[in-house]
């Protein structure tokens, strides 16, 4: 059985303000079984993007159908970007526990800065 | 709130077909897999089919080349074409709404599908 | 497939549990379903392994360790006598299976 790899092809990402930014994330293996979450940032104060699983976030929308039994595509895209969007990103995945998940797998992350404006 | 309402079941001669449907509301129907339960009498649960949001399809080997289910997610509602019929797809056919990892959290009600000679 | 006794009974307001076996946690979600009579719309009781709806009782809670699921009924009730099934869904399948089912009595 493979072991299941993160994939974030992008180590930077350049964006502009006010565009759609997407971040590229898939993963190798569907199991073990559990949710993929975004992260902006490493640590307890890392800050919540996208929960696969539950959670309203209304400038997020996933690239593929998140509802196939075998979408392994948790690539997601941003709207309107501000500059206090930049960080660096993080798709992780997470095996079932009880009572919590557990953080099972991180991708490398995705840098995003602003690049300059378009002339 | 939410509410699944089947339709298009009744009494089939074997090798006849049926259209069965799934009225859903209180929901963004769209956002959501569904699939097709059914019980035999008697019987326990079967899982027959299911269908992504956008439209992929699974099916429970007994039933593949004949079962086709589908949605239009404009008039939130769910399909299974059911052809060739035999007496062992004689059951109450439930549509339910799947959670994020494919269990289910809404069921509706039922509609009964009898293939009799 | 999953295996689930066939009968459990309890006394009123006593902690009853029934279990499902035969799946494997790293690859399986599992749901409980409860049926008050035969060919009635099922209700689920628990989805993801102890997830509880909302409008469901907080006397009903679910787990899962290795290859077993457990529901259990914290003061179980007359209204909580019913059919219950165990369901799961296997990741490497793509497919959801049921148990046969448990018939819970409460005397």
């Known amino acids: 059985e493979e072991e299941l790899q993160m994939i974030q092809p992008e180590k930077l990402l350049l964006v502009t303000v006010g565009k759609t930014a997407t971040l590229h994330c898939t993963v190798t293996s569907l199991l073990p079984v559990g949710p993929v979450l975004w992260f902006r940032g490493v640590g307890p104060g890392r800050e919540l993007i996208y929960n696969q699983k539950e959670g309203h976030f209304p400038r997020v929308t996933t690239v593929s159908d998140l509802t196939k039994r075998n979408n392994m595509d948790f690539s997601i895209r941003i709207s309107s970007i501000t500059p206090a969007d930049v960080g660096t990103y993080y798709c992780v995945k997470f095996r079932k526990g009880s009572p919590e998940n557990v953080e099972f797998k991180s991708g490398p992350g995705t840098e995003m800065a602003l690049g300059a404006k378009p002339s | 709130d939410v509410q699944l309402v089947e339709s298009g079941g009744g009494v089939v001669r074997p090798g006849e077909s049926l259209r069965l449907s799934c009225a859903v509301s209180?929901?963004?129907?769209?956002?959501?897999?569904m699939s097709w339960v059914r019980q035999a009498p008697g019987k326990g649960l079967e899982w027959v089919s299911g269908?992504?949001?956008?439209?992929?399809?699974y099916y429970v080997d007994s039933v593949k080349g004949r079962f086709t289910i589908s949605r239009d997610n404009s008039k939130n509602t769910l399909y299974l074409q059911v052809n060739s019929l035999t007496a062992e797809d004689t059951a109450i056919y439930y549509c339910?709404?799947?959670?994020?990892?494919?269990?289910?959290?809404?069921w509706g009600l039922g509609t009964l599908v009898t293939v009799s000679s | 497939a999953l295996t689930q006794p066939a009968s459990v009974s309890a006394d009123l307001g006593e902690t009853v549990k029934i279990t499902c076996s035969g799946g494997?946690?790293?690859?399986?979600?599992y749901g409980w379903y409860q049926q008050k009579s035969p060919g009635s719309a099922p209700v689920t009781v628990i989805?993801?392994?102890?997830e509880r709806p909302s409008d469901i009782p907080s006397r009903f809670s679910g787990s899962a360790s290795g290859s077993t699921a457990t529901l259990t009924i914290t003061g179980v009730r007359v209204e909580d006598e019913a059919i219950y099934y165990c369901?799961?869904?296997?990741?490497?399948?793509?497919?959801?299976?049921f148990g046969a089912g448990t018939t819970l009595t409460v005397l």
């Open positions: 369901g799961a869904y296997d990741g490497s399948t793509y497919a959801n299976t």
């Open positions: 209180g929901f963004r129907f769209s956002s959501y897999a």
């Open positions: 989805y993801s392994d102890d």
């Open positions: 494997d946690s790293s690859s399986h979600y």
């Open positions: 269908i992504s949001s956008g439209g992929d399809t």
């Open positions: 339910a709404r799947e959670t994020w990892n494919h269990l289910f959290d809404y």
